[in-house]
Interface confidence: low
C-alpha cells in the first residue's frame, strides 16, 4: 500500500475540526493577472502581496496593481494601495526587501515615457508607511542593499550609470558611468566592471574591474582585460582574457582584489563558461564548461585559497551560460550536494556527494520502489532526482528538491528509480538522513513544504484540475492525513510559507474562475492546534550524522569531525516552536588520507585514496603563481581539505618557498593596478 495508507499510521485526533478553526480565506478584489508575495522580516508575520493586471490596448498597455499587507502570517490582508498613491508597480523589479529585520521595503513604480527619472516608494517600518521618491535616473536593476548597512543602496541606470544612496534611497549620487555589473562585497565595498569604448557587450573581455570602499569617494582599478567577475564566500573571482588568444582564465583574490593568483583551472574559449556552483568561506565548487555544445563540463573543488583545484566530477550537466544545472546544496546536512551528470548514452543520472565533492556516488534505491524501464537490471538501480533541468524541460515536476538547515537530515525531491532520469510522471521521495537512504513519500508529482523545523510536512497534488485538498504528515512523510480546506475547489498556483521553515502557517494560493471573472484567493492554515504541546526532552533522540558503519570507531567522520544531533522522534506529535535551535555535539576525528585533497601536480586514481604525481609533471619543479609571485612547492602530494578539522593520525608534509620571481602569466599583477579619487 502507498505510504500513509496502512494500519500502522496513527491518525492525528480530531484534526479536521482543529484545522477548520484555523483556516482563513481571503478573496482579493482583483482581476487575475500576476501575483507576487514577499515576507518582510523574520518572525514578524508581515507579508506584502502585489497583484498586477495588464490590459493590452491598441496603442499601449494599461496596467493596474494593488498592494496588500498582512501582519498575521497571511490570515488577513488589508489593501494598502493608497499608501503608494495607487501607482502601478513594476513587477520585473519585484519588491526589494531589506536584509535581516531592517523592515525596509523598496517598490519601483512604472513612470510615463517622458519623465526625467524613475520613481520608488520606500518604507522602513515593515510597510506600514511609504515615502514616494522621484529618482534622477531610470533604474535598470532592482535596488541592491548593502548586506552590512541597509541604508546603503546601489542601482544601475538604463544609461549604465552606477548610482548609490547613503540614506535609504532618499538622495542618490552617480558615482561612475559606463558600468556593466556591480555587486556589494563585504564591509560596504562595491565591485564593478566598466567599459571604455562602445558598450558592455562590445568590450567583453576588455572590461576593467574597479573597487570603491567608501561609496564612491575613491576608486581602485583592481583588474584589466576582464570578461566577468563573481563573489563567493571570501573569494573574489575574475575571468580574464589571455594576451595572445581568445581564451580566458580564472583569477582569484582573497583580499578584495589587492593581490591576485591564477586559479589552477583549465582556460576556456569564447563559447565556454565558468560558473561558481557554491562557495563558502572555506572553499568553492567551480564548473568549467567542456568545449563544444556538449551540455556538460567538469566540477572542480578548490583548496582554502581558491587556487589549487581538484577534479571532483566529470560530465556534469550544465546546459549553457546562465542555463540549467541540477547542482543542489543539501542544507539539512553538512557536506552533502546533489547534481546530475550526462552519461555517454545521453541519459541523465543523479549523483550525490557526502564529503563536499571528494567522492560522488549514485543515490541508493528506495526500498519500497521497483526499477523502471530505464534499468538494465530490474534488481539494481538508483534513485534519480528531478531538479532545475527537468523543470526547464517542462517535465511534470512542479518543484525542485527541498531541504532546510533546521530540519536536520530531511531532503524531499521528485524522482524516478532506474538507470537514469525518466520522462515519465515522477513520484516524491524523502530522505531523513541527508540523502543516504530514501523512501517513496507520495505517488505522483506534488508541491511540498516543511513547517515547524520538520515537525510537519505539507503537500498538495500537482494537477491541472481545481483542488481543495491538502495533505500533511507529522512523522517526516511516513503517514499522511488529508484535509479539505474549502468546499469550492480553486486553481492552485502556489504554496507559501515563511522562509526558514519555522512557521506553522501555510498559505495556499490560487484563483477561482466564474463565467465572467477570475479572482485571486488565498487560504492560510495554522497547524498550531495539530501540534498541541511543546516538545520536551523525551521527544528527542540522539542521531549520529553520516553514520554508515556503527561498528567503526571513525563512523560518521566527515571533513575531520562527526556530529551528533538531537532529533525529534517520528512518533512525537509536538511543536519544535519558533525558537527551536538545532542541538548538535561535534567531536574531532583522527586524520586519514581522506582528509586531504591532492595538491597541485598530483591526482587521485579512481578508487584510490593515495595521491600520485601527474605523469606530465614527474621530475619537474612544481612552480605556480601566487599573489603575482612564482612559488616553489615541496610536497608529497597532499593538502588538507578546506574546513576539515581532523587532528593527529596521518600528517603528510608540504612546504611552499617563495621563488622571488614575478609570474609572467598573471594578468592582474599589482603593477597594473592604480587608484584614483573623486
Amino acid at each position: 500500500s502507498a505510504p500513509g495508507e496502512d494500519e500502522e499510521c496513527g491518525r492525528v485526533r480530531d484534526f479536521v475540526a482543529k484545522l477548520a478553526n484555523n483556516t482563513h480565506q481571503h478573496v482579493f478584489d482583483d482581476l487575475r493577472g500576476s501575483v507576487s508575495l514577499s515576507w518582510v522580516g523574520d518572525s514578524t508575520g508581515v507579508i506584502l502581496v502585489l497583484t498586477t493586471f495588464h490590459v493590452p490596448l491598441v496603442i499601449m498597455t494599461f496596467g493596474q496593481s494593488k498592494l496588500y499587507r498582512s501582519e498575521d502570517y497571511g490570515k488577513n490582508f488589508k489593501d494598502i494601495t493608497d499608501l503608494i498613491n495607487n501607482t502601478f508597480i513594476r513587477t520585473e523589479f519585484g519588491m526589494a526587501i531589506g536584509p535581516e529585520n531592517s523592515g525596509k521595503v523598496v517598490l519601483t513604480a512604472e513612470v510615463s515615457g517622458g519623465s526625467r527619472g524613475g520613481r520608488i516608494f520606500r518604507s522602513s517600518d515593515f510597510a506600514k508607511n511609504f515615502v514616494q521618491t522621484d529618482l534622477p535616473f531610470h533604474p535598470l536593476t532592482q535596488m541592491m542593499y548593502s548586506p552590512q548597512n541597509s541604508d546603503y543602496l546601489l542601482a544601475l541606470s538604463t544609461e549604465n550609470g552606477l548610482w548609490v544612496s547613503k540614506n535609504f534611497g532618499g538622495k542618490w549620487e552617480e558615482i561612475h558611468k559606463a558600468v556593466c555589473l556591480a555587486k556589494w562585497g563585504s564591509d560596504n565595498t562595491i565591485f564593478f566592471t566598466t567599459y571604455a569604448n562602445g558598450s558592455c557587450k562590445a568590450d567583453l573581455g576588455a572590461l576593467e574591474l574597479w573597487r570603491t570602499s567608501d561609496l564612491g569617494k575613491s576608486f581602485k582599478t583592481i583588474g584589466v582585460k576582464i570578461y566577468s567577475f563573481g563573489l563567493g564566500g571570501r573569494f573574489l573571482f575574475a575571468s580574464v582574457m589571455a594576451d595572445k588568444d581568445t581564451t580566458r582564465r580564472i583569477h582569484v583574490s582573497t583580499d578584495q582584489g589587492d593581490t591576485w593568483s591564477m586559479a589552477q583551472l583549465p582556460s576556456v574559449g569564447q563559447e565556454q563558461f565558468y560558473s561558481i556552483l557554491a562557495a563558502n568561506d572555506d572553499m568553492v565548487f567551480m564548473h568549467v564548461d567542456e568545449p563544444g555544445d556538449t551540455g556538460f563540463g567538469t566540477i572542480f573543488t578548490s583548496d582554502d585559497r581558491g587556487i589549487v583545484y581538484s577534479k571532483s566530477l566529470d560530465r556534469h550537466l550544465y546546459t549553457t551560460t546562465g542555463g540549467e544545472t541540477d547542482f543542489t546544496n543539501v542544507t539539512s546536512l553538512r557536506g552533502v550536494y546533489i547534481t546530475s551528470v550526462l552519461s555517454e548514452d545521453n541519459s541523465i543520472q543523479t549523483m550525490i556527494t557526502f564529503d563536499q565533492g571528494g567522492r560522488w556516488t549514485h543515490l541508493r534505491k528506495p526500498e519500497n520502489s521497483e526499477c523502471d524501464a530505464t534499468a538494465k537490471n530490474k534488481n539494481e538501480c538508483s534513485l534519480h532526482i528531478h531538479a532545475s533541468y527537468s523543470i526547464s524541460q517542462k517535465l511534470n515536476v512542479p518543484m525542485a528538491p527541498l531541504s532546510e538547515p533546521n530540519a536536520v537530515g530531511i531532503v524531499i525531491a521528485h524522482g524516478s528509480v532506474g538507470d537514469a532520469i525518466s520522462v515519465m510522471v515522477p513520484d516524491v521521495y524523502i530522505s531523513d538522513d541527508g540523502g543516504y537512504s530514501w523512501t517513496k513519500m507520495l505517488e505522483g508529482p506534488h508541491y511540498y513544504t516543511i513547517l515547524d523545523s520538520g515537525g510537519i510536512i505539507v503537500a498538495i497534488e500537482h494537477s491541472s484540475r481545481p483542488i481543495n485538498v491538502i495533505k500533511f504528515s507529522t512523522d517526516e512523510g511516513q503517514c499522511w492525513q488529508t484535509y479539505t480546506f474549502t468546499r469550492d475547489p480553486i486553481y492552485f498556483t502556489g504554496l507559501a510559507s515563511e522562509p526558514g521553515a519555522r512557521s506553522m502557517n501555510i498559505s495556499i494560493w490560487g484563483f477561482t474562475e466564474s463565467f465572467l471573472t477570475s479572482q485571486w484567493v488565498s487560504y492560510t492554515i495554522d497547524f498550531k492546534d495539530i501540534l498541541e504541546r511543546n516538545c520536551e526532552e523525551k521527544d528527542y533522540t540522539i542521531w549520529l550524522a553520516h553514520s554508515t558503519d556503527p561498528e567503526d570507531y571513525e563512523d560518521g567522520c566527515i571533513l575531520g569531525y562527526k556530529e551528533q544531533f538531537l532529533r525529534l522522534r517520528k512518533s512525537s506529535v509536538c511543536q519544535n516552536g519558533r525558537d527551536y535551535v538545532v542541538t548538535k555535539q561535534p567531536s574531532i576525528c583522527l586524520c586519514s588520507l581522506e582528509d586531504f585533497l591532492c595538491d597541485f601536480g598530483y591526482y587521485r586514481p579512481e578508487n584510490d585514496s593515495k595521491c600520485v604525481e601527474q605523469p606530465e609533471l614527474k621530475g619537474h619543479d612544481l612552480e605556480f603563481c601566487l599573489y603575482g609571485r612564482e612559488e616553489h612547492l615541496t610536497t608529497n602530494g597532499y593538502r588538507k581539505i578546506p574546513g576539515d578539522k581532523c587532528q593527529g593520525g596521518v600528517n603528510p608534509v608540504r612546504e611552499v618557498k617563495d621563488l622571488k620571481k614575478k609570474c609572467t602569466s598573471n594578468f592582474l599583477s599589482p603593477e597594473k593596478q592604480n587608484s584614483k579619487s573623486n
Partner: antibody, heavy 125, light 108 residues
Framework: QVQLVQSGAEVKKPGASVKVSCKAS????????ISWVRQAPGQGLEWMGS????????NYAQKLQGRVTMTTDTSTSTAYMELRSLRSDDTAVYYC??????????????????WGQGTTVTVSS | EIVLTQSPGTLSLSPGERATLSCRAS???????LAWYQQKPGQAPRLLIY???SRATGIPDRFSGSGSGTDFTLTISRLEPEDFAVYYC?????????FGGGTKVEIK
C-alpha cells in the same frame, strides 16, 4: 540502407494469438528501441508499447497490459510483438518503428524515424 | 494521459497554398518530446518533425514546426501535390505516449 521488414498478413479467429516479427537492418539494433503502433481501418494511430533492444525493458499501453508481449532477438536483429486473446476490434495494420526512446530515457526525443511496411491482422470468426 | 487534439479535422487547399495544422495538448508537453508524422493511403507513417521544430533527415524545408506548452503547429509553406496526406502529432512527454486524431490535407 536502414530498414525494418515485417512479417506477412495474418487472419485469426477471436481468442487466438498472433505474433508479428520485425527484422532490422542497416543500423546497430541494440542502440535503439522498437515501438509498436497499430491502426484500425479508417482510424488514427494507437501506440501499443515499446521495447529497448539494448536491455529488453518494455513499456506497454495500459489497455493492452496482460495481452501483449514484446521481445527482441539481438542475434538476428529482430523484434517480435505477440497479442493474445484476439478480439474483432484488434483488426488493424500493425507497424513497428525504430524509436530512440524505447525503454531507455534520453533527455531528448528524436521521433520514430524508421517504420516497417505494416502487417495486416484480421480477426474474424 | 495527455490528450492531443488536432484541428481542423480536414483541410481543403490547393497546391501552392500555405497549410497550418494545429495540435493542442490537454496539459503541458515538453517541446523536445513532440513529433509530427505524415501518412499517405496504404503507406506507413513518415517522421517529419521531432523536438517540436527540428526537421527529420530528408524532409524539405517547406515543412516547419513550432510551439510550446500546450499549443503546437505544423506549417507547410507551399503545398506540393505529394503533400496531400494525413498528418499526426505525437507526444512522449508523459506516459503513455499518445497520438493526435490526425488532420487530413486534401486537394480543393
Amino acid at each position: 540502407q536502414v530498414q525494418l521488414v515485417q512479417s506477412g498478413a495474418e487472419v485469426k479467429k477471436p481468442g487466438a494469438s498472433v505474433k508479428v516479427s520485425c527484422k532490422a537492418s542497416g543500423y546497430t539494433f541494440t542502440s535503439y528501441g522498437i515501438s509498436w503502433v497499430r491502426q484500425a481501418p479508417g482510424q488514427g494511430l494507437e501506440w501499443m508499447g515499446s521495447i529497448s533492444a539494448y536491455n529488453g525493458n518494455t513499456n506497454y499501453a495500459q489497455k493492452l497490459q496482460g495481452r501483449v508481449t514484446m521481445t527482441t532477438d539481438t542475434s538476428t536483429s529482430t523484434a517480435y510483438m505477440e497479442l493474445r486473446s484476439l478480439r474483432s476490434d484488434d483488426t488493424a495494420v500493425y507497424y513497428c518503428a525504430r524509436d530512440p526512446s524505447g525503454g531507455t530515457t534520453l533527455h531528448y526525443y528524436y521521433g520514430m524515424d524508421v517504420w516497417g511496411q505494416g502487417t495486416t491482422v484480421t480477426v474474424s470468426s | 494521459e495527455i490528450v492531443l487534439t488536432q484541428s481542423p479535422g480536414t483541410l481543403s487547399l490547393s497546391p501552392g497554398e500555405r497549410a497550418t495544422l494545429s495540435c493542442r495538448a490537454s496539459q503541458s508537453v515538453r517541446s523536445s518530446y513532440l513529433a509530427w508524422y505524415q501518412q499517405k493511403p496504404g503507406q506507413a507513417p513518415r517522421l517529419l518533425i521531432y523536438g517540436a521544430s527540428s526537421r527529420a533527415t530528408g524532409i524539405p524545408d517547406r515543412f516547419s514546426g513550432s510551439g510550446s506548452g500546450t499549443d503546437f503547429t505544423l506549417t507547410i509553406s507551399r503545398l506540393e501535390p505529394e503533400d496531400f496526406a494525413v498528418y499526426y502529432c505525437d507526444q512522449l512527454g508523459s506516459s503513455p505516449r499518445t497520438f493526435g486524431g490526425g488532420t487530413k490535407v486534401e486537394i480543393k
